[in-house]
């Protein structure tokens, strides 16, 4: 017993004055607590606790389950203990079969011995299976066997406590180790869709999936820049060991424009946090916005192809699309498709394929699209560039030479005189009169230009060239002059 100063309270004395006592099964346990201020005896083994208010603890016929720590406490709260082993050949271990271990922590296999004099007190795998190579343990006859630094791989490991008693190996009841995983990563969070577009009054519902090693992960939906508690519904399940999944579904039954914003699904565990967001846009009504992918004024050469392409945003989804020319609807030559296969896609593409365009096929081509809320359209003005064509070239009765040419863009007519038999007409002749004949006519056809020169200006034999040209090409017509004496012969026009 410890020595103390006079007047200072001291712990009680126990008889027999030993720290440990071994009693055979069936024999008596008699423990005496000597203290003027005796309060109680306490017995502890595994999770069991018993009390006795008498200063002498007597168990007439000791059983293995009487093995444990007996503590005597006095009125000053001071105590002394003795550990009693009740040796029972038929019951070497006391067991509490519940066995949990927190990952990376130590855990106790509770199989205290009833006989401290056995040897090889250790752990063994069930059915002769070896224990994991890295499993380390420390035996303590009074408490059990401590597994050091529990690994996740030990989950559901089947174990026995084992000891050699009189040369024979004795096994306890089996233990199944349940490992409580440590959080070693942030939760994995994902959302059903990254963005939502709705009309007022429609239901907004979005699901966040949270995955972690256990259900003790915390999760919630939050509205950015708002503290309002959102209405959530949950489902959860275990896909197996350390594979827990929760679905948190956020619902706004009738969305309003002011519900628009960013919603965050937030999850955290002891390792850290993770989040994912979804964006809600609520519009008061649907819309269609059309974006031409080429200029709406199109110039194309005669015989060539052109594709009229639009992209458009439509919400709700488009119901009718058509391409129109001169009040006629195209049944083919066009295609319409979504810009992406994404579920939340609202962008579409429409293409009209015009092939080998003729000069007569210029005009306004209109794309029309509608959904349940709105209609929209866009027009393309298509001009077909054509090489000039000389429609007429005549000598008029008044002696004028006249050339009429048609084409697009508007042709320019130049006049040249070639003296004698020269083929090269280099000397230009200024026209007397130039007119655009159909400037006020339909806007997309060929433009007709008329140009005249005075033939009386020519005094020698030769050829007059009327040359019509534009950006696409050129065409010429010729007038031949022949003089006989002072008389001008008939002029022969040719191209």
């Amino acid at each position: 017993q410890p020595s103390v100063s006079p007047g200072e309270p001291s712990p009680p004395s126990i008889h027999p004055a030993k720290s440990e006592l071994i009693v055979r099964v069936g024999n008596e346990i008699r423990l005496l607590c000597i203290d003027p201020g005796f309060v109680k005896w306490t017995f502890e083994i595994l999770d069991e606790t018993n009390e006795n208010k008498q200063n002498e603890w007597i168990t007439e016929k000791a059983e293995a389950t009487n093995t444990g720590k007996y503590t005597c406490t006095n009125k000053h709260g001071l105590s002394s203990s003795i550990y009693v082993f009740v040796r029972d050949p038929a019951k070497l271990f006391l067991v509490d079969r519940s066995l949990y271990g927190k990952e990376d922590n130590d855990t106790l296999v509770r199989c205290p011995l009833t006989d401290p004099e056995v040897t090889s007190y250790s752990l063994k795998g069930c059915q002769g299976k070896p224990l994991p190579k890295d499993l380390r343990f420390v035996p303590d006859p009074k408490a059990g066997i401590t597994i050091k630094s529990v690994k996740r791989a030990y989950h559901r490991l089947c174990l026995h406590c084992s000891a050699d008693q009189e040369g024979k190996s004795v096994l306890s009841d089996k233990f199944i180790l349940k490992v409580r995983p440590a959080f070693k990563a942030v939760p994995v969070v994902s959302v059903s869709k990254a963005s939502y577009l709705l009309r007022e009054g429609e239901e907004f519902t979005v699901t966040c999936t949270i995955k972690d090693v256990s259900s003790s992960v915390y999760s919630t939906w939050k509205r950015e820049n708002s503290q309002t508690k959102l209405q959530e519904k949950y489902n959860s399940w275990h896909h197996g060991d350390f594979n827990y999944e929760r679905q948190a579904t956020l619902t706004i039954s009738s969305a309003r424009v002011n519900d628009s914003g960013v919603f965050m699904c937030y999850a955290n565990n002891t390792f850290g946090s993770a989040n994912v967001t979804t964006t809600l846009e609520v519009v008061d009504k649907g819309f269609i916005n059309i974006f031409p992918m080429i200029n709406t004024t199109v110039f194309v050469n005669d015989g060539e192809n052109v594709d009229l392409i639009v992209e458009y945003e439509a919400f709700p989804k488009p119901e009718h699309q058509q391409w129109i020319y001169m009040n006629r609807t195209f049944t083919d030559k066009w295609e319409d498709y979504p810009k992406s296969e994404n579920e939340s896609n609202i962008r579409y593409v429409s293409e009209l394929h015009l092939t080998r365009l003729k000069g007569t096929e210029g005009g306004t081509y209109t794309f029309l699209v509608s959904n349940s809320d709105v209609n929209a359209s866009i027009a393309f003005n298509v001009y077909v560039n054509t090489k000039p064509e000389i429609l007429t070239y005549d000598r008029l009765v008044n002696g004028m030479l006249q050339c009429v040419a048609a084409g697009f863009p508007e042709p320019t007519i130049d006049w040249y005189f070639c003296p004698g038999t020269e083929q090269r007409c280099s000397a230009s002749v200024l026209p007397v009169d130039v007119q655009t004949l159909n400037a006020s006519g339909p806007p997309f056809g060929k433009l007709v230009v008329q140009s005249s020169i005075d033939s009386s200006a020519f005094k020698h034999n030769g050829t007059v060239e009327c040359k019509a040209y534009n950006d696409v090409g050129k065409t010429s017509a010729y007038f031949n002059f022949a003089f006989k004496g002072n008389n001008k012969e008939q002029i022969h026009p040719h191209t």
Partner: antibody, heavy 119, light 107 residues
Framework: EVQLLESGGGLVQPGGSLRLSCAAS????????MSWVRQAPGKGLEWVSA????????YYADSVKGRFTISRDNSKNTLYLQMNSLRAEDTAVYYC????????????WGQGTLVTVSS | DIQMTQSPSSLSASVGDRVTITCRAS??????LNWYQQKPGKAPKLLIY???TLQRGVPSRFSGSGSGTDFTLTISSLQPEDFATYYC?????????FGGGTKVEIK
């Protein structure tokens, strides 16, 4: 020692409301999910609702969804069940139960409180 | 929802008998099955969790087995205090569901 004590049961008319409480002691309340389980007279057990340790996640049986709300106050070690729009078929003994670790069942139960819905 | 079907709904047995109760899930629940014992006028008591793990303080005459959809509770030698109603329950996914119960009566 783990203890769960329900209160708040009684007689209520159809369409009425009632709030059950469950006072917990003997363990770290916020570490455990909690559930309500009910048993109609002479019938089997029916799980009603559950709530995670932090109170963040809540779960309901289809039969009570939209009418019952589970909540907890970890500072008071108390679990609640707010029951609205009560029906005759909600008549039962309501038990509060502690959820053990992931999927390991309800390891501690209260003694139950009787809710009678009748006109 | 996952349906849990217990059979039989009741059985008569004598002290010392070996009793077997089965529980079938409508879809796989891995090993997330629990067994409870309930005596008249009392709250249920957890016997077995994780299909086969005995809850602390439960006598070793009780055992559980099974995985996936089919599970069994066995009482190796029925004792007078074992006459009660037994329920299985899945904790695999919400909503959690109980079987209809099996009443074990004295023959």
């Amino acid at each position: 020692e783990v203890q769960l004590l329900e209160s708040g049961g009684g007689l209520v008319q159809p369409g009425g409301s009632l709030r059950l409480s469950c006072a917990a002691s003997g363990f770290t309340f916020s570490d455990y999910p909690m559930s309500w389980v009910r048993q109609a007279p002479g019938k089997g057990l029916e799980w009603v609702s559950a709530i995670g340790g932090s109170g963040g996640d809540t779960y309901y049986a289809d039969s009570v969804k939209g009418r019952f709300t589970i909540s907890r106050d970890n500072s008071k070690n108390t679990l609640y069940l707010q029951m609205n729009s009560l029906r005759a078929e909600d008549t039962a003994v309501y038990y509060c139960a502690r959820g053990a670790y992931d999927g390991e069942g309800f390891d501690y139960w209260g003694q139950g409180t009787l809710v009678t819905v009748s006109s | 929802d996952i349906q849990m079907t217990q059979s039989p709904s009741s059985l008569s047995a004598s002290v010392g008998d070996r009793v077997t109760i089965t529980c079938r899930a409508s879809q796989t629940i891995s090993g997330y099955l629990n067994w409870y014992q309930q005596k008249p006028g009392k709250a249920p008591k957890l016997l077995i969790y994780d299909a086969s793990t005995l809850q602390r303080g439960v006598p070793s005459r009780f055992s559980g087995s099974g995985s996936g959809t089919d599970f069994t509770l066995t009482i190796s030698s029925l004792q007078p205090e074992d006459f009660a109603t037994y329920y299985c329950q899945q904790n695999y996914r919400t909503p959690f569901t109980f079987g209809g119960g099996t009443k074990v009566e004295i023959k």
